[in-house]
C-alpha cells in the first residue's frame, strides 16, 4: 500500500544528534527510543559534528537542513563546489525557490539538483525559479569557481502529491541514531518488504552496526529472509543472509536498508546503529560532474 | 541459480536506432542495481549505464549521455537500453550486469552490437 | 582517457606471485570500493574481488585485493596456466557519478 504521511515532530524533524526511525504509515509511538542489545563496534573514525550541533557555523557547505523551512546562503563560500542535504518526513517533497544568483554560467558555474527520479543541472534564468523534488529529500550542489559567487535558497516542504514509498518504510536523519527493524502487525501490508532510509550530511559516509536474529533459513525464492543495505548513489549492494552481527560502510551520505517480506514473515529482528563517518581520502574539490547540457 | 540473457543485437546504420533487453531468469532482479556494459572489439571494458533496483536513479556514461537510455522492468525482470543516433564507435559487445560492484555480481554472455553502413 | 589506469601486461613463472596495480584518484579509488574482474577471450567478465578484499564464494584464496589511498593492488599467488587472462579493477567514481574501469591488464604464465 501507498501508506500515509508520516508526521515527525517538529522537534525532532529539526533536532541535532541521534533520531529514530517513523514508519511511512505508523503512530508516532512505534518511533520511541528502544534499548540497544549491544554497543556499537569500534568507530574506526571520529564520529562528524551534525550541522546542526555547531551553534555557529561559518559555511553553508556540507549541512543538513531537516527544519520544514529555510533559508540556505550558499554565496561566496569559498569552496568550488559546495553540497547541501535537505530532508523531510516520508510522505513530504521538498520545494526550493532562487531568492538571488551570481553564478557565472559562461564560466561553467552550476546549480545540481539530484535526488530520487531527480537530476537537474541548472544555471541560467534561475532567479525565482521554483522547483519541487519528487520525494522526501533533496542534494542540492553549487559549483562555483569565483569566490563571493553563488546562490540564495528559500526551501519549504508540503504533502507529496504522490507518494514511492511503502506504508512500513522508515526514514533516520542526522548524523547518528539507532535502527530497529519493523515489526508489522498481522493488519499491516508488507508487499515487496520494507525499507529504511538512512541520510546524513553530504561528504559523509554512514557506518552501520547491527545484530541480525531469527532470521530463518531461507535464501532463495519468495519467501527468502535477508536483509539488503544500498548504497543510493553509487548502487552498491550488500545482501545478508542468516543470524549474525553485521557492519557496513557506504560510499556516500545515502543508504537504504530493505528487510525483506521473508524477513518480516519470520518475525525476525535487526537493532543496532548508523553513524557517520569522514571520506577516506579528503576529497579534491575539483568536481568533474558538471559536464553536460543544462536541464539533464 | 541467475541467468541474464541479452538480446537485440544485430548491425545498424549510423545514426539509426536499437534497443537491446537482458531477462533474468531469477527470483533477485528486482533487489539489484543493473548496468550495462559495453567492450568493442580487441579494447577493455567500459561501462555504460546504470538503474537503481528500483529504477529511480539513473546514471550514463559520458559517451552515451543523452543518445542512451537505461530502463527497467520489474514485472518482466527485464533491462533494457533504447540507443539512439547510433555513432561507429558503438560497436562493440553489449553486457549486462548485476549488482555489478557487489558480491551478488552476475553477466550475461553479451550481444554485439554493429554500427555500420 | 582512463581515469583509473592499470598496466598493459605482467608475466610471472608457474607457482610465483603477480600483482597488478590500479591507480587513480580521490574521487574514484581513493574514497570508493574497488572491485576486480577476470576475463577470458571471448567470454563475460566474472568477479574476483569486491569490497577492496572481499571474495566471491568459489573464488580460491590465492586472489587476493588490497587498497592504500587512491591505489589497489590484486595478487594472485601460486600462478597457474589458467589465470591467463585480462584483469580489470572498477570502482565507483563520486565525481562522474559513474561507474569507471581501469584499461586492463593480460597476465601471461611463462
Known amino acids: 500500500g501507498q501508506g500515509t504521511p508520516s508526521l515527525v515532530p517538529h522537534e525532532e524533524a529539526a533536532a541535532p544528534g541521534r533520531t529514530t526511525a517513523t514508519p511511512a504509515g505508523a503512530s508516532l509511538e512505534w518511533s520511541q527510543a528502544r534499548g540497544l542489545l549491544f554497543s556499537p563496534a569500534p568507530q574506526p573514525r571520529r564520529l562528524l559534528p551534525g550541522p546542526q550541533e555547531n551553534s555557529v557555523q561559518s559555511s553553508a557547505c556540507g549541512r543538513q537542513h531537516l527544519e520544514p523551512t529555510g533559508t540556505i546562503d550558499m554565496r561566496g563560500p569559498g569552496q568550488a563546489d559546495c553540497a547541501v542535504a535537505i530532508g523531510r518526513p516520508l510522505g513530504e517533497v521538498v520545494t526550493l525557490r532562487v531568492l538571488e544568483s551570481s553564478l557565472n554560467c559562461s564560466a561553467g558555474d552550476m546549480l545540481l539538483l539530484w535526488g530520487r527520479l531527480t537530476w537537474r543541472k541548472m544555471c541560467r534564468k534561475l532567479l525565482d525559479m521554483t522547483f519541487s523534488s519528487k520525494t522526501n529529500t533533496l542534494v542540492v550542489r553549487q559549483r562555483c569557481g569565483r569566490p563571493g559567487g553563488g546562490v540564495l535558497l528559500r526551501y519549504g516542504s508540503q504533502l507529496a502529491p504522490e507518494t514511492f514509498y511503502r506504508e512500513c518504510d522508515m526514514q533516520l536523519f542526522g548524523p547518528w541514531g539507532e535502527i530497529v527493524s519493523p515489526s508489522l502487525s498481522p493488519a499491516t501490508s508488507n508487499a515487496g518488504g520494507c525499507r529504511l532510509f538512512i541520510n546524513v550530511a553530504p561528504h559523509a559516509r554512514i557506518a552501520i552496526h547491527a545484530l541480525a536474529t531469527n532470521m530463518g533459513a531461507g535464501t532463495e525464492g519468495a519467501n527468502a529472509s535477508y536483509i539488503l543495505i544500498r548504497d543510493t548513489h553509487s548502487l552498491r549492494t550488500t545482501a545478508f543472509h542468516g543470524q549474525q552481527v553485521l557492519y557496513w560502510e557506504s560510499e556516500s551520505s545515502q543508504a537504504e536498508m530493505e528487510f525483506s517480506e521473508g524477513f518480516l514473515k519470520a518475525q525476525a529482528s535487526l537493532r543496532g546503529q548508523y553513524w557517520t563517518l569522514q571520506s577516506w581520502v579528503p576529497e579534491m574539490q575539483d568536481p568533474q560532474s558538471w559536464k553536460g547540457k543544462e536541464g539533464t | 541459480q541467475v541467468q541474464l540473457q541479452e538480446s537485440g543485437g544485430g548491425v545498424v546504420q549510423p545514426g539509426r536506432s536499437l534497443r537491446l533487453s537482458c531477462t533474468d531468469s531469477?527470483?533477485?532482479?528486482?533487489?539489484?542495481?543493473m548496468h550495462w556494459v559495453r567492450q568493442a572489439p580487441g579494447k577493455g571494458l567500459e561501462w555504460v549505464a546504470g538503474?537503481?533496483?528500483?529504477?529511480?536513479?539513473?546514471y550514463y556514461a559520458d559517451s552515451v549521455k543523452g543518445r542512451f537510455t537505461i530502463s527497467r522492468d520489474n514485472s518482466k525482470n527485464t533491462l533494457y537500453v533504447q540507443m539512439n543516433s547510433l555513432r561507429g564507435e558503438d560497436t562493440a559487445v553489449y553486457y549486462c550486469?548485476?549488482?555489478?560492484?557487489?558480491?551478488?555480481?552476475?553477466w550475461g554472455q553479451g550481444t554485439l552490437v554493429t554500427v555500420s553502413s | 582517457e582512463l581515469v583509473v589506469t592499470q598496466p598493459p601486461s605482467v608475466s610471472a613463472a608457474p607457482g610465483q606471485k603477480v600483482t597488478i596495480s590500479c591507480s587513480g584518484s580521490?574521487?574514484?579509488?581513493?574514497?570508493?570500493?574497488v572491485s576486480w574482474y577476470q576475463q577470458f577471450p571471448g567470454t563475460a567478465p566474472k568477479l574476483l574481488i569486491y569490497?577492496?578484499?572481499k571474495r566471491p564464494s568459489g573464488i580460491p584464496d590465492r586472489f587476493s585485493g588490497s587498497k592504500s589511498g587512491t591505489s589497489a593492488t590484486l595478487g594472485i599467488t601460486g600462478l597457474q596456466t589458467g589465470d591467463e587472462a585480462d584483469y580489470y579493477c572498477?570502482?565507483?567514481?563520486?565525481?562522474?557519478?559513474?561507474?569507471?574501469f581501469g584499461g586492463g591488464t593480460k597476465v601471461t604464465v611463462l
Open positions: 550486469a548485476r549488482d555489478l560492484r557487489g558480491g551478488e555480481d552476475y
Open positions: 531469477g527470483f533477485t532482479f528486482s533487489r539489484y542495481a
Open positions: 538503474i537503481s533496483y528500483d529504477g529511480s536513479y539513473e
Open positions: 580521490t574521487s574514484n579509488i581513493g574514497n570508493n570500493y
Open positions: 569490497d577492496n578484499n
Open positions: 572498477g570502482t565507483w567514481d563520486s565525481s562522474l557519478s559513474a561507474v569507471v
